[in-house]
């Protein structure tokens, strides 16, 4: 299955959203920083595609959950929130297309179970992080920023997947 | 191949929450990427979609319902949940639980076969 | 959210005929994101077709699916007795997840 050109795009839309949510300077909360300790290994080119599929979607799925609670609600510009929860749901579509195209609807794609456990504890990090912070301005910005960087390092795998067509 | 039981009060009176509990068998509700779903059918009516929670966490729900529904995964017991705030007759439906493929959020292949839920005062 | 309109509410064949439910939706469901199940008395469920064309594991190849956009048809090419029943069609590609009214296939 190819991924669309315009996943491609949501993906750009994605990032360049979360560059506008920001709020206060990353310089400013020097001190809140955090090594949330992004499990880059399991986005490494290595993967075939059908495994790299259901990393990307923990991935997307996890982002969407973490940026659509009540905390996340009152930390955020709600336009820019609304515009976010669009790509993000525009991407799980395009990777349930690939799904529905290469498999049978009562077989169960190459599961990566431990690639999955590991972006899922990535999160948990993140939320724990946040729970101990208060969920202050400064933790979600740098939040914000970790997001930022962790996604687009994902973002990255999807073009060099495409490049291996 | 994975299974669900619905299982819940079967008579209710208005203003009550409604819990129901689907347990799954043949399949754990925590691993993978599935999402769990909650569907209702008032008596000879059609289907309505309520809600489902990913294994992973997080939950979507219908915006007709949002504010008076919950989902919730127990891991331990291998169950998914449905509760439904201040119930009134519209609420009497087969509640049904479903799970679909992996990654995929809206189709519904497996089928708990439903369990009656009335709201009569 | 998009409105599945299903037609006719009422279809009555025989045995042996052929069967073209339709469902249309009030805007483009996104990637063929559709799917249809067949009800039949104090059943769950049961999925036919998802992604608007492909038949699930199991279903007999006299069901067939197609459409895309906003217009999608089921096709049963030759009427068994146990083909009998409701028939919803769904969309899975923008929350809320929607159903059509169903349509009752019965003996004529």
């Known amino acids: 299955c190819d991924l669309p050109q315009t996943h491609s795009l949501g993906s750009r839309r994605t990032l360049m959203l979360l560059a506008q949510m920001r709020r206060i300077s990353l310089f400013s909360c020097l001190k809140d920083r955090h090594d949330f300790g992004f499990p880059q290994e399991e986005f490494g080119n290595q993967f075939q595609k059908a495994e790299t599929i259901p990393v990307l979607h923990e991935m997307i799925q996890q982002i969407f959950n973490l940026f659509s609670t009540k905390d996340s609600s009152a930390a955020w510009d709600e336009t820019l929130l609304d515009k976010f929860y669009t790509e993000l749901y525009q991407q799980l579509n395009d990777l349930e297309a690939c799904v529905i195209q290469g498999v049978g609807v009562t077989e169960t794609p190459l599961m990566k179970e431990d690639s999955i456990l590991a972006v899922r504890k990535y999160f948990q990090r993140i939320t724990l992080y946040l729970k101990e912070k208060k969920y202050s301005p400064c933790a979600w910005e740098v939040v914000r920023a970790e997001i930022m960087r962790s996604f687009s390092l994902s973002t990255n795998l999807q073009e060099s997947l495409r490049s291996k067509e | 191949q994975v299974q669900l039981q619905e299982s819940g009060p079967g008579l209710m009176k208005p203003s009550e929450t409604l819990s129901l509990t689907c347990t799954v068998s043949?399949?754990?509700?925590?691993?993978?990427?599935?999402?769990w779903s909650w569907i209702r059918q008032p008596p000879g009516m059609g289907l309505e979609w309520i809600g489902y929670?990913?294994?992973?966490?997080?939950?979507n729900y219908n915006p007709s319902l949002k504010s008076r529904v919950t989902i919730s995964v127990d891991t331990s017991k291998n169950q998914f949940s449905l509760k439904l705030n201040s119930v009134t007759a519209a609420d009497t439906a087969v509640y049904f639980c479903?799970?679909?493929?992996?990654?995929?959020?809206?189709?519904?292949?497996?089928w708990g076969q439903g369990t009656l839920v009335t709201v009569s005062s | 959210e998009i409105v599945l309109t299903q037609s006719p509410g009422t279809l009555s064949l025989s045995p042996g005929e052929r069967a073209t439910l339709s469902c249309r939706a009030s805007q483009s469901v996104s990637s063929s994101f559709l799917a249809w199940y067949q009800q039949k008395p104090g059943q769950a469920p049961r999925l036919l077709i998802y992604?608007?064309?492909s038949r699930a594991t199991g279903i007999p190849d006299r069901f067939s699916g197609s459409g895309s956009g906003t217009d999608f048809t089921l096709t049963i090419s030759r009427l068994e007795p146990e083909d009998f029943a409701v028939y919803y069609c769904q969309q899975y590609g923008s929350s809320p997840y929607t159903f059509g009214q169903g349509t009752k296939l019965e003996i004529k």
């Open positions: 929670i990913y294994s992973g966490g997080g939950a």
């Open positions: 043949g399949g754990s509700v925590s691993s993978g990427s599935y999402y």
């Open positions: 992604g608007a064309s």
């Open positions: 479903a799970r679909g493929i992996p990654m995929v959020r809206g189709i519904l292949h497996y």
